[in-house]
């Protein structure tokens, strides 16, 4: 029986009965928040073999092992993960071992086993046999291994029953509990699963099988399950579903998402039955189950019941997130706000069409309208009194409408009105007339030439850069000395710079009148010598990073023919030099034979250039004589050997480490002080733990259903 869609067992242990007939849980399994210690021995679910998403255990009192509950759980597919994890065991106060002795495969995702004070048999499980990559596993804060004394079956009787593998250079027996070995298939099977008798399964089987080389005898399927058979791909007229099985069209046509209160139904796309068309696709008509590619961003029509949507805060803008067509009128009235330009772009940046009018008034926080970065059509189906479809009134800091070199905007019907925008140059308005096709529609009073732009440098001269020099973290630039008609009017220069991976930035990006600005600013005084060109050294930059830079002259508000003259440069794009990359991450080595080592690593977090090759160095180390000094068969004399696992529990450090020579004489030494990098790593580690714990709590503590 397929159970699902996701099973949440909490508060009452008797809810476990819901699992009675399940062979596959299509979704997740949560067992959590059972605070009263119970006797779980009467609960056993031998039918359960597969969980398609993840298994989460959290604060279940009295549960000592999972082996009795789920003796045949073989595969956790990890089709959807819990914060990147397919198996999470967190704060299980009484759990003594995991005991999932038939667990053979976690197809996707890592494991997180944390804060289980009594949990042992963690170092005896070779997770690399179950997961593809163990580097993201997080096993921290459990019972210290030295207090566990984990022994695999037969070890004490000197008749070890389990097989050995190497983990962290330690060759040892692998088991789940004191009487359950970890199953390993013969090397002849390669990546294939095997039966209890070590016969190789069919290649389409995953985890295990009841008969060798038979695709109908698999416990779980490597790819997809259809009509009792494991298949590499779904047969014609069937579709992949939930990552593990094939369903027919009729099935897909009749299912709805339980996460939504609408009844939109699933779609078939690219051979899969899925809840929504993927990004960049849209349903092909209201009754269709199929997806077609969108031309540009996928359309999303938003409508305002009251016809006019007032945007006076980030919250009101949030309602328009993802909208591409707005049916109605936009009234923008942003007087203040924090980081307002980028917030508005985030929520309104996809709007392409407004069917009514657009009115911007008293928006003193706005410097530019570029946050409406995709607006291309104002239909003007509804207009303001006086037949206006674009109305801009009393915006004290508005300096730019849009970057007209990269913007096509059409106003299909209606006129434009501009008044009392003291920093908006009339030339900018005239440019908009030309681009939008409204030239000739406006009457004389619609664009006021006296109170628009009367406090702006509307006649701008161009500053030209004369030289640029770069190093790995510095840029030196110089520019022509600007000479206004009256030299005394030139006060200084301001250099603006920021990281710009693409050559598409504008002066007003991320800028608002409330102090937010995505540009870094540096003031540059005039050189005292009139023959020296002004310049700046920008330092503390990142290697191999493209920056955008422009310069503005700071001048007195000198009026000449009713206009203030100013000067600024074009935007210059310049890349810093390459540098040495940071160290490669997550270096792991393992031996797969007596003469080979396999070394794996991840690329550096800061490549600081184009990586062309890696250098791998190795050297032979003397054999550790410590290995031969102990009787490993004696339970009491197992030596405490620590392997760095990326975390340090303070209480585990019980004595000063002995070092060879310290201060000229042999003897105990204090631990070296932590480096900045180590301190930073510990800080990040603590932060990561907090983030996960918050995620866990936010996910599982939910209001009671009404």
């Amino acid at each position: 029986e397929i159970c699902g869609p996701g099973i949440d067992i909490r508060n009452d242990y008797q809810q476990l009965k819901r699992l009675e007939n399940c062979t596959v849980i299509e979704g997740y399994l949560h067992i959590l928040l059972i605070s009263k210690a119970e006797d779980y021995r009467s609960y056993r679910f031998p039918k359960l073999t597969v969980i398609t998403e993840y298994l989460l255990l959290f604060r279940v009192a009295g549960l000592e092992s999972l082996g009795d509950l789920f003796p045949n759980l073989t595969v956790i597919r990890g089709w959807k993960l819990f914060y990147n994890y397919a198996l999470v065991i967190f704060e299980m106060t009484n759990l003594k071992d995991i005991g999932l002795y038939n667990l053979r495969n976690i197809t996707r995702g890592a494991i997180r086993i944390e804060k289980n004070a009594d949990l042992c048999y963690l170092s005896t499980v070779d997770w690399s046999l179950i997961l593809d990559a163990v580097s993201n596993n997080y096993i921290v804060g459990n019972k210290p291994p030295k207090e566990c004394g984990d022994l695999c079956p037969g070890t004490m009787e000197e008749k070890p029953m389990c097989e050995k593998t190497t983990i962290n250079n330690e060759y040892n027996y692998r088991c789940w509990t004191t009487n359950r070995c970890q199953k390993m298939c013969p090397s002849t099977c390669g990546k294939r699963a095997c039966t209890e008798n070590n016969e190789c399964c069919h290649p389409e089987c995953l985890g295990s099988c009841s008969a060798p080389d038979n695709d109908t005898a698999c416990v779980a399927c490597r790819h997809y399950y259809y009509a009792g058979v494991c298949v590499p791909a779904c047969p014609p007229n069937t579709y992949r579903f939930e990552g593990w099985r094939c369903v027919d069209r009729d099935f897909c046509a009749n299912i709805l998402s339980a996460e939504s209160s609408d009844s939109e139904g699933f779609v078939i796309h690219d051979g899969e039955c899925m809840q929504e068309c993927p990004s960049g696709f849209i349903r092909n008509g209201s009754q269709s189950m199929y997806c077609i590619p969108c031309e540009g961003p996928c359309p999303k029509v938003c409508e305002e019941e009251k016809k006019t949507k007032t945007i006076d805060s980030v919250t009101s803008a949030q309602m328009l997130q993802g909208c591409t067509i707005f049916k109605g009128n936009l009234l923008i009235n942003i007087r203040r706000g924090n980081n307002i330009a980028s917030e508005l772009e985030n929520f309104m940046g996809l709007i392409e069409v407004v069917t009514g009018y657009v009115k911007i008034r008293h928006s003193h926080a706005l410097v530019s309208l570029s946050f409406l970065k995709n607006l291309r059509l104002i239909l003007g189906e509804e207009q303001l009194e006086g037949n206006y479809s674009f109305y801009v009134l009393d915006n004290q800091n508005l300096q730019q409408l849009w970057d007209w070199d990269h913007r096509n905007l059409t106003i299909k019907a209606g006129k434009m009105y501009f008044a009392f925008n003291p920093k908006l140059c009339v030339s900018e308005i005239y440019r908009m007339e030309e681009v939008t096709g409204t030239k000739g529609r406006q009457s004389k009073g619609d664009i006021n030439t006296r109170n628009n732009g009367e406090r702006a440098s509307c006649e701008s001269d161009v500053l030209h850069f004369t030289s640029t020099t770069t190093s790995k973290n510095r840029i030196i630039i110089t520019w022509h000395r600007y000479r206004p008609p009256d030299y005394r009017d030139l006060i200084s220069f301001t250099v603006y710079y920021k990281e710009a991976p693409f050559k598409n930035v504008t002066e007003y990006d991320g800028q608002d009148a409330c102090g937010s600005n995505s540009w870094n600013m540096v003031d540059v005084d005039l050189p005292p010598n009139k023959d020296v060109e002004p310049g700046i050294l920008l330092h503390g930059l990142k290697p191999w990073t493209q920056y955008a830079v422009y310069v503005k002259a700071v001048t007195l508000t000198m009026v000449e023919n009713d206009h203030i003259r100013g000067a600024k440069s074009e935007i210059l794009y310049i890349r810093t030099n390459a540098s040495v990359p940071s160290i490669p991450l997550d270096v792991l080595s393992a031996s797969n034979s007596s003469s080979q080592l396999i070394v794996k690593w991840n690329p550096p977090s800061l490549p600081n250039g184009n990586l062309s090759y890696y250098i791998v160095r190795w050297q032979r180390q003397p054999q550790d004589g410590y290995l031969y000094r102990h009787n490993y068969c004696s339970k009491d004399k197992i030596p405490i050997r620590k392997y760095a696992d990326g975390t340090i529990d303070i209480e585990e450090v019980t004595e000063n480490p002995k070092t060879e020579v310290c201060g000229g004489e042999k003897g105990p030494c204090c631990a070296c002080p932590k480096t900045e990098a180590e301190k930073q790593a510990e800080k990040e580690e603590a932060e990561y733990r907090k983030v996960f714990e918050n995620f866990l709590h936010n996910s599982i503590f939910v209001p009671r259903p009404e």
């Epitope: 979704g27 009749n254 209160s261 609408d262 009844s263 939109e264 209201s286």
Partner: nanobody, 128 residues
């Protein structure tokens, strides 16, 4: 408070037609999926038809396909079921239901668990 009030039921001869209405209040009608269910005497409740809010996508039970038509008028907050070519086996109490979020996963449109609120029902009797 969510309210669903069905109307339009009654006695009709086989082959005849009826139009059921469901007046909704207490929620934003235009954003919720809706459905019609029915329960014949001594039988389980079964899904008849459903309709989505955003696109108007419709679903029908095999037994009514081609005879019944579901529709909605979001401006009037009303759900309709046009029933033509009625048969004796269509006799039942017809209920209107509104979708609700039910956590993760999926369900079939005709599963009652996907619906959070129900009307009181209207009786349709098909008899000669």
């Amino acid at each position: 408070e969510v309210q669903l009030v069905e109307s339009g039921g009654g006695l009709v001869q086989p082959g005849g037609s009826l139009r059921l209405s469901c007046a909704a209040s207490g929620f934003t009608f235009g954003t919720f999926g809706m459905a019609w269910f029915r329960q014949a005497p001594g039988k389980e409740r079964e899904g008849v038809s459903a309709i989505s809010a955003s696109s108007g996508r419709t679903y029908y039970a095999d037994s009514v396909k081609g005879r019944f038509t579901i529709s909605r008028d979001n401006s009037k907050n009303t759900l309709y079921l046009q029933m033509n070519s009625l048969r004796a086996e269509d006799t039942a109490v017809y209920y209107c239901a509104v979708r609700s979020k039910q956590g993760a996963g999926y369900g079939f449109w005709y599963e009652g668990r996907l619906y959070g609120y129900w009307g009181q029902g209207t009786l349709v009797t098909v008899s000669s």
